[in-house]
């Protein structure tokens, strides 16, 4: 048993059949020491009596808000919550696998530039009784800080007969230089809680393996005299770090219809210019990524041919 | 510390083409070692992430944007002393912080020259005769320090009479493609930089 | 299978029009572009133009502007290439070729020998 | 134009060997190169699309790198069927233009 935060405690559970539990003593915080009894969430039904509760947790039966009292007044709580570990492996029952960039991915991280500044998220089919916490460092044993904010819920899906929700959180490392060369990673941990399940997530990677541009800006077209060129120009996004000269982007531009399985022309350039055959309906779409270190593409930046 | 000679302006700066080379063959050398020593800890996931040059040079502090030297984050720099006569140097437009950081560029990739040859003729007797350094890589560290032309005491190649394990062998050589694939892209960053100013 | 099936070798004398075709199979026609290269004996690749079938889009490379035709029927599924004005440089092996990215080239015909002689 | 450059314009090598074929162009064209191979009296077969992105169907002895103006196709273990001529051809600007070839000879 291990203390989350104030009068809120998380007991490690091996899940299985006629497992034999958890032995767990609640000390009442208070310097009374008679007519002290406890009771469990809104049951009157007294489980006993005395400064100390010893109890056998085994299931989620067992779990929740222990309160001890003395004549009719509350003295204090302990939330004890549940993690359940099945085959040697930690119960992730609350978040939905991404499997994206590979299997068990609960949570996914993107950065916009190198500015120490990040995006995680993470997916649930769950919509109530359901927190989260987040902590961030860089490294582990004598780590370096990064503050995150409180984790939100950023978008709502419908995937089938399922609701799907979407939460979020941004971080930011507290003391980062954008030219740096990271050699301890980002650890990011997420404590999740439905109902009085607990759960932990965790992800380690250094920024610029997250690096993830917004699309180029202010796409402009202009047509070549006497040719069906042509020539497309943007700017870098203004989220992007700078300088550019040293910070540089490479560019891939394509003119596609609107099906994929349309015919394309495509070509890559480290310029903020390029010359491209339009078609009518199509389209000509700009995407970036770093020009050194090859982490993800942005997302399409379009604008129609015609 | 002397400042560079002055060079007739080489307009593009001559640097950029070899340091675009250099990064190009490290990526392909570290695709190469993570494809056939798949069975070994050598993806960035598993490696500890060393860097051989710290503190005996501070690239990333030398060779700084002037408008990352305002960011706080970015000045913890190390003092270290250099030789400097490039002839990467534009001449004249060369300010002392550049020579410095070019001459750091050259100690970097010295230090690798060197660990990259000692690791090369450790592999060499291995008689799984599982991989070997691309010759094309060392090829190219050594154009790129004949285009940076500094004058440098040269290190000794470091011999070793113990029987090498080549599996230790073998996760080091990962280790050191990855750190100098990460000092490989602050290099082309810098030249970029530079042949834009 | 996508594919690509030429014209017959032709044979022309220097001031001439050839006009050879290539019949494509296994696809939509109109949903790839089609290109022609051209490869004169002990010699490398010459690249002439291509053309858009949907639309009738054409471009030709400079060096045969104004010789070069390139027309496409979607009724017959068949790319033809026109080259006139024939020199003896002209004799060569002619390949259409085609793909859905405009500028490289996936699928080839077999190619078609047109020589121009005297 | 953009001229494409070859080398070497030959080389014999053995069954086994690794061979590296390179291709250089007259101005920059960030990896809008691609590579194909041609057998006498055949038309040639794409390779490698975009300087190093495999082609599916290619065995996986032939990759190919680079960028800007500098590329490279590697041939890791030559097979008896690996020897005929290589072109490689930019995509950068039109006109479309190829290298001169390198033939893969027999030692």
């Known amino acids: 048993i291990w203390e989350l935060k104030k009068d809120v405690y998380v007991v490690e559970l091996d899940w299985y059949p006629d497992a034999p539990g958890e032995m767990v003593v609640l000390t009442c915080d208070t310097p009374e020491e008679d007519g002290i009894t406890w009771t469990l969430d809104q049951s009157s039904e007294v489980l006993g009596s005395g400064k100390t509760l010893t109890i056998q947790v085994k299931e989620f039966g067992d779990a929740g808000q222990y309160t001890c009292h003395k004549g009719g007044e509350v003295l204090s709580h302990s939330l004890l919550l549940l993690h359940k570990k099945e085959d040697g492996i930690w119960s992730t029952d609350i978040l939905k696998d991404q499997k994206e960039p590979k299997n068990k991915t609960f949570l996914r991280c993107e950065a916009k530039n190198y500015s120490g500044r990040f995006t995680c998220w993470w997916l649930t089919t769950i919509s109530t009784d359901l927190t989260f916490s987040v902590k961030s460092s860089r490294g582990s044993s004598d780590p370096q800080g990064v503050t995150c904010g409180a984790a939100t819920l950023s978008a709502e899906r419908v995937r089938g007969d399922n609701k799907e929700y979407e939460y979020s959180v941004e971080c930011q490392e507290d003391s980062a230089c954008p030219a740096a060369e990271e050699s301890l990673p980002i650890e990011v941990m997420v404590d999740a809680v439905h109902k009085l399940k607990y759960e932990n997530y965790t992800s380690s990677f250094f920024i610029r393996d997250i690096i993830k541009p917004d699309p180029p800006k202010n796409l402009q077209l202009k047509p070549l005299k006497n040719s069906r060129q042509v020539e497309v120009s943007w700017e870098y996004p203004d989220t992007w770090s700078t300088p550019h000269s040293y910070f540089s982007l490479t560019f891939c531009v394509q003119v596609q219809g609107k099906s994929k399985r349309e015919k394309k022309d495509r070509v890559f350039t480290d310029k903020t210019s390029a010359t491209v055959i339009c078609r009518k309906n199509a389209s000509i779409s700009v995407r970036a990524q770093d020009r050194y270190y090859s982490s993800s593409w942005s997302e399409w930046a379009s604008v129609p041919c015609s | 510390r002397n400042l560079p000679v002055a060079t007739p302006d080489p307009g593009m700066f001559p640097c950029l083409h070899h340091s675009q080379n250099l990064l190009r063959a490290v990526s392909n050398m570290l695709q190469k070692a993570r494809q056939t020593l798949e069975f070994y800890p050598c993806t960035s996931e598993e490696i500890d992430h060393e860097d051989i040059t710290k503190d005996k040079t501070s690239t990333v502090e030398a060779c700084l944007p002037l408008e990352l030297t305002k960011n706080e984050s970015c000045l913890n720099s190390r003092e270290t002393s250099f030789i400097t006569n490039g002839s990467c140097l534009a001449s004249r437009k060369t300010s002392f912080m550049m020579a410095l950081c070019l001459s750091s560029i050259y100690e970097d990739l010295k230090m690798y020259q060197v660990e990259f040859k000692t690791m090369n003729a450790k592999l060499l007797m291995d008689p799984k005769r599982q991989i070997f350094l691309d010759q094309n890589m060392l090829a190219v560290i050594d154009e790129l320090m004949q285009a940076l032309n500094f004058n440098s005491e040269t290190v000794p190649q470091k011999s070793s009479l113990e029987e090498p394990d080549f599996y230790k062998t073998k996760i080091k050589l990962c280790i050191l493609l990855h750190a100098f694939r990460i000092r490989a892209v602050t290099i082309d960053r810098v030249m970029s930089y530079l042949n834009a100013s | 299978e996508v594919q690509l099936v030429q014209s017959g070798a032709e044979v022309k004398k220097p001031g001439a029009t050839v006009k050879i075709s290539c019949k494509a199979s296994g696809y939509t026609f109109s949903d790839y572009y089609l290109h022609w290269v051209r490869q004169r004996p002990g010699k490398g690749l010459e690249w002439m133009g291509w053309i858009d079938p949907e639309n009738g889009d054409t471009e030709y490379a400079p060096k045969f502007q104004g010789r070069v035709t390139i027309t496409a029927d979607t009724s017959t599924d068949t790319g033809y290439l026109e080259l006139s004005s024939l020199r003896s440089e002209d004799t060569a092996v002619y390949y259409c070729a085609a793909n859905k990215e405009l500028r490289y080239f996936d699928v080839w015909g077999q190619g078609t020998l047109v020589t121009v002689s005297s | 134009d953009i001229q494409m450059t070859q080398s070497p314009s030959s080389v014999s090598a053995s069954v086994g060997d690794r061979v590296t074929i390179t291709c250089r162009a007259s101005?920059?064209?960030?990896?809008?190169l691609h590579w194909y191979q041609q057998k006498p009296g055949k038309a040639p077969k794409l390779l490698i699309k975009f300087a190093s992105q495999s082609i599916s169907g290619v065995p996986s002895r032939f990759s190919g790198s680079g960028s800007g103006t500098d590329f490279s196709l590697t041939i890791n273990s030559l097979q008896p069927e690996d020897f005929a001529t290589y072109y490689c051809q930019q995509s950068n600007s039109f006109p479309l233009t190829f290298g001169g070839g390198t033939k893969v000879e027999i030692k």
């Open positions: 101005q920059s064209i960030s990896i809008n």
